[in-house]
């Protein structure tokens, strides 16, 4: 089995995790994709997934998680906004391809969220305009319950993560099911 590696990202409460998962667009452009958390001794749990079939660049939001699948680019973007300490954990992107096992990432994201808002700009945001306009209408796609406990050996999509700047404005107007609660229960 292929050894899964992980990258550690240390963020402050309130910041945004921004992950870009590359995939072969000819193979997986319209496939359903998901963002999962992996807890010790448990099977991966799906927190959010794209629609089936996945819609091009159409944002899907579940709580504070936003997925955007860019078919033209072979890129799934995952954002977790207004991070909380309890969001800390191990995450991964997967591509569902039934009846085969999910197509998983080598690089998992080890997210560590600490208390206190950083006054130092994050490494990936330098815009003069950086307003995250979270859609007021939340699209919640039905996610398959099945996730394989086994590691796949085929070449997976690739992923990396960004940390947004502390001065990024998160506009939560008219959003009813965002924050105040952990991403998962």
């Amino acid at each position: 089995a292929t050894k899964l590696t992980e990258e550690k990202y240390e963020l402050k409460e309130g910041q945004t995790l921004d992950v870009k998962c590359d995939y072969t667009l000819e193979k997986f452009a319209s496939s359903q994709k998901a963002w999962q958390i992996i807890r010790d001794g448990e099977m991966p749990k799906t927190l959010a997934c794209t629609e089936r079939p996945s819609k091009n660049s159409h944002p899907v939001q579940v709580g504070r998680i936003i997925l955007e699948d860019y078919h033209d680019h072979g890129l799934l973007r995952v954002r977790m906004v207004n991070l909380q300490v309890e969001d800390s954990g191990l995450y991964q992107c997967v591509i569902y391809q039934p009846p085969k096992e999910p197509h998983m990432l080598f690089d998992r994201i080890r997210l560590v969220v600490t208390k206190g808002f950083s006054g130092t700009p994050g490494s990936n945001e330098n815009s003069t305009q950086n307003v995250y306009k979270i859609p007021p209408t939340t699209t919640k796609a039905l996610c398959p319950l099945y996730t394989s406990p086994r590691t796949v050996t085929q070449a997976p999509p690739k992923s990396t993560a960004d940390v947004s700047t502390p001065d990024s404005e998160i506009n939560l107007t008219n959003v009813t099911d965002i924050i105040r609660v952990p991403v998962f229960n």
Epitope: D22, H73, K133, K158, D162
Partner: antibody, heavy 116, light 107 residues
Framework: EVQLVESGGGLVQPGGSLRLSCAAS????????MSWVRQAPGKGLDWVAS????????YYVESVKGRFTISRDNAKNSLHLQMNSLRAEDTAVYYC?????????WGQGTLVTVSS | EIVMTQSPATLSVSPGERATLSCRAS??????LAWYQQKPGQAPRLLIY???IRATGIPARFSGSGSGTEFTLTISSLQSEDFAVYYC?????????FGGGTKVEIK
Amino acid sequence: EVQLVESGGGLVQPGGSLRLSCAASGFTFSSNWMSWVRQAPGKGLDWVASIKQDASEIYYVESVKGRFTISRDNAKNSLHLQMNSLRAEDTAVYYCVRGGWRFESWGQGTLVTVSS
Amino acid sequence: EIVMTQSPATLSVSPGERATLSCRASQSVSSNLAWYQQKPGQAPRLLIYGASIRATGIPARFSGSGSGTEFTLTISSLQSEDFAVYYCQQYKNFPLTFGGGTKVEIK
């Protein structure tokens, strides 16, 4: 077929302004991030700015912040770069590119020369 | 800012031979790395993304590998049309940054 056609380049004096435009066709413009990348004569590639589909996220390289403004008109399938307070070091071929992180399609570029 | 360093600056190779180009990042970019080819007087063309995924229409002789800070672009058997300048680019963090380029010339 994806087509990106830049216009608006030319000779301008230091401190002057130019507005570059890019006409896009052959793909769903309103579903794509767009960017500008430049290349000084005989030099390498430099990213300038990126803009999300709905302009809710915009990013610039530090050297142009406060001087350049990227914008888009999804109704007209067009991308723009307003360049003010131009400097000699802004002299380059400016490419309109499809994508916000990596760049799948490129225009042929428009040359901007800043010189007195 | 993540600094991308390419080596060598110039690579002299005979047609039919293998070419190996290197790209190093000043900090980890995981697999968010792309390779471009640029011929004189032309715009760049995307070859590889996700460090190892070939872009649409790119011949199989082009392959990418690496993760983290060390990356390689390999052209298994150079064709005449492959002589050009090659750039790597990271897209993990803004500002997006390119390497200085490697010129692949005919030996």
